[in-house]
Amino acid sequence: HTAAQDNCTCPTNKMTVCSPDGPGGRCQCRALGSGMAVDCSTLTSKCLLLKARMSAPKNARTLVRPSEHALVDNDGLYDPDCDPEGRFKARQCNQTSVCWCVNSVGVRRTDKGDLSLRCDELVRTHHILIDLRHRPTAGAFNHSDLDAELRRLFRERYRLHPKFVAAVHYEQPTIQIELRQNTSQKAAGDVDIGDAAYYFERDIKGESLFQGRGGLDLRVRGEPLQVERTLIYYLDEIPPKFSMKRLTA
């Protein structure tokens, strides 16, 4: 059995409020901000996590400009609207009635507009490229060891099916992890690559979402793998729709 039953906590999401008020006195956890019930045996959706993050006290964050060729998660925090399943609603608006369309990982994929803006569907992000630079080590990591450890990390820690880790590339000190997951490939119960990438990003930044104070402990053959830079690129099934003005800015 899990600690959630003993202590009534959520192993996979520390941004929850838990109480033994479920069926049969079982522990039930709800996400901060939205109050939605979460399944603590798997990852919580990025939308609910962002909503919880915005409901908590926070420091001002510096924004990073997106790349002109791909959508980049620039950590531009906002309080998102989530659907009943915890996914991002296709259209997001702020308090001043400025609206925009987002993809399945919540990254803006259109110019900003007003309340008349239409976002017909939530466009799926089917390919995520995680670009890391590790801190200097005595020597390069063995590529096959690194590949195996990162695949195992995504399978065990993030519960992502191995078939969705398409490739691990390594040219010291750069590591690239490719995640691919088409709509047709994702079965019920499968972790979404966007959620896995978000948990990984927060882990790498030392802001683990998992319960407990341990944080991520990543090693390759006993050697700590410490990351000093992370960039995440998102590719959607349908290309984003930005005006030429933005593309030439």
């Epitope: 600690a3 820690r157 341990g214």
Partner: nanobody, 125 residues
């Protein structure tokens, strides 16, 4: 279904030794940080020892340092606690616990996700 099953508890005289085992099923054992906790009669559950998932780091409560040794055999999916020079105050139900994969270790019960049912160790003459 994840299961942790402790064994090896029993009655032992002061100064004696016991070796506790914790067998895991349903986990890829060598990615989980592991720990032993104990709960003396009428008291709170307390930390005893932990070991990182990679096996490179161990940590002990001051009360057991130099007497207890935590170890793991990844090929057998088993965690051990070798207890020497046992004292009456070591009497407790001993629990093994597993943290979330690739997490660092911790000394609090909330740092661990999966728990066994416990095995009773009684130190008495």
């Amino acid at each position: 279904q994840v299961q942790l099953l402790e064994s090896g508890g029993g009655l032992v005289q002061p100064g004696g030794s016991l070796r506790l085992s914790c067998a895991l099923s349903g986990l890829t054992f060598n990615t989980y940080p592991m720990a032993w906790f104990r709960q003396p009669p009428g008291q709170e559950r307390e930390f005893v020892a932990d070991m990182s998932w990679s096996g490179t780091n161990t940590y002990y409560a001051d009360s057991v340092k130099g007497r207890f040794t935590i170890s793991r055999d990844n090929s057998k999916n088993t965690l051990y606690l070798q207890m020497n020079s046992l004292r009456a105050e070591d009497t407790a139900v001993y629990y093994c616990a597993a943290g979330w994969p690739y997490s660092g270790t911790g000394r609090s019960t909330t740092d661990y996700t999966y728990w066994g049912q416990g095995t009773l160790v009684t130190v008495s003459s």
